[in-house]
Amino acid sequence: NIDVCKLGTVTVQPAPVIPLGSAANISCSLNPKQGCSHYPSSNELILLKFVNDVLVENLHGKKVHDHTGHSSTFQVTNLSLGMTLFVCKLNCSNSQKKPPVPVCGVEISVGVAPEPPQNISCVQEGENGTVACSWNSGKVTYLKTNYTLQLSGPNNLTCQKQCFSDNRQNCNRLDLGINLSPDLAESRFIVRVTAINDLGNSSSLPHTFTFLDIVIPLPPWDIRINFLNASGSRGTLQWEDEGQVVLNQLRYQPLNSTSWNMVNATNAKGKYDLRDLRPFTEYEFQISSKLHLSGGSWSNWSESLRTRTPEEEPVGILDIWYMKQDIDYDRQQISLFWKSLNPSEARGKILHYQVTLQEVTKKTTLQNTTRHTSWTRVIPRTGAWTASVSAANSKGASAPTHINIVDLCGTGLLAPHQVSAKSENMDNILVTWQPPKKADSAVREYIVEWRALQPGSITKFPPHWLRIPPDNMSALISENIKPYICYEIRVHALSESQGGCSSIRGDSKHKAPVSGPHITAITEKKERLFISWTHIPFPEQRGCILHYRIYWKERDSTAQPELCEIQYRRSQNSHPISSLQPRVTYVLWMTAVTAAGESPQGNEREFCPQGKAN
């Protein structure tokens, strides 16, 4: 709020802009007939220092010269970088109550001369872009600093642009607004940046470049692909490019991939044939361009073209398995199962499967198509049967896979030995076995089959299986394996026309069951008690149950209970015990045991055996 210096003037020596570390003299002079009205000798001039509008110092003690009542000179030192405001005020000492009156003020800027600009870098984006250069300005000057970018080319042609840096904006890039045409490819250009402020000037070293050094082609555009004769593996990639491009780089990958296929194409003229694509696969394609084989810069990658290659007929063979169930004396139900082809084998959307069941002597053939991965038929129990399945998409069908239908567990001599199941981790079970001891025909393959031991699993859920070569005696099963669930695992040994199997239960992780079995009845028959129970609900078993335990003790007794341990069998739900005294009341209960421990006890039942009738 300085009133335009009516009372006097303030001047600075050597200048209002000084280098860091320099001192300055500030003189405050009153105009004629200004000052304290009655006693000019009582005029006292004071100098106040403000930083960011905040009073920081009264420079009363820094007077170096004084013309009483007319002017005073103050020396200021140790000024910080940036701007500092000094205000001269008049203090009429005879009137203590009146505040000092502002006379005039001055701003002093402290800064440094600019350093020579460095690291000049110029670029022209595309053949029709303009040349823009950037540079490193060096240390902040704290003063308004002007930068001039000057470009010189052939025939003494010159072009320049200017900008400035201050405390609000930074100038380290300029667009010259000039475009270099490709016919200057061999020409050399020189660019330099000059910096000037009130404390000095400096100039960069000249930076020399050619057209090829700075022109970055625009990324290719309008990318498309044409599949030859609707082929899923061959396609012509096409795009638009700037006229001077001589080299392209193509990269492409399936969308779920993490590594690109890279191709360099010279003089492609916007067209390139690809021959190694995977049918029915989502691909991403990108292209980059360069104006010179050896020099110059690559363009940015183009926008992605995402497209799916066409289908081709399926390849590979289906993995088939089956289940046989006798219905009555002359009929059996055959359930065929197969695994979906993986995408690289399916090579398209599988529309249906062609299933054939054939009696080997060709008397009977059953054929059908299905969209499912299973098929069930009732056939006679007589005759030798074979099954085949093939997968079809819009372009054709895979070669059929054949399997002989044999009695899977019919030959004891083919049963694998010493089958074991060990939990590997939360979702794996390692199954091992020994080959059949006295097989009268060679084992062609082993099938490891598993399904959860839960009610209705045979009818509700298809089996899971793995095919194992005949020289392998182990399998790590992981598909659909969940912790705390018991699985029935069968190892089948198959020859050309026979099958043998062994069964075991296994889990990938176990805990003690949540509860014990529920005793439903206790009956007495011929001096033996029969304990009947219901099995623990499936979710509460928490793994494979190894044994049940039946506990009993005399009512009100504090003695340890007696117990009987029973090997777990799913089909068993009663057991006899015979060591109870007649006409003594007993309390009975049951628990279940997994590899992790014993469950809490189930319900308690009281029973008093009657013994022999008199």
Epitope: G153, Q160, K161, I178, S181, D183, L184
Partner: nanobody
């Protein structure tokens, strides 16, 4: 919108003089290349003289050096070409061009590089 308007052409005897003017509207002279071109019947347009207002550089074709002088009056936004010692070879349509935005190997002489053009003024040198 930028408009360039040439004037000052006419018929003159060999050895005579003419002063061409190019008045610019919608355009400021600061930091731009401006030039004079001519085109004789059946020939390509050729650069005669140019001035770079940003740095004060002045360029002349060899054929007119020491005879022609290019200058500008920033206050009047006008470009001039003073032509002395005219010869019949100087006959043609003279055009004013402004804003060299594309550099070709011909530099300031290449007419393809300029963004704005006037309609032209005819100069005929004949006895």
């Amino acid at each position: 919108q930028v408009q360039l308007q040439e004037s000052g052409g006419g018929v003159v005897q060999p050895g005579g003089s003419l002063r061409l003017s190019c008045a610019a509207s919608g355009y400021t002279f600061s930091n731009h290349h401006m030039g004079w071109f001519r085109q004789a019947p059946g020939k390509e347009r050729e650069g005669v003289a140019a001035i770079y207002t940003g740095a004060g550089n002045i360029y002349y074709a060899d054929s007119v050096k020491d005879r022609f002088t290019i200058s500008k009056d920033t206050a009047k936004n006008t470009l001039y070409l003073q032509m002395n010692s005219l010869t019949p070879e100087d006959t043609g349509m003279y055009y004013c061009a402004a804003d060299l935005t594309r550099w070709y190997s011909g530099g300031w002489r290449d007419p393809r590089g300029y963004k704005y053009w006037g309609q032209g003024t005819q100069v005929t040198v004949s006895s």
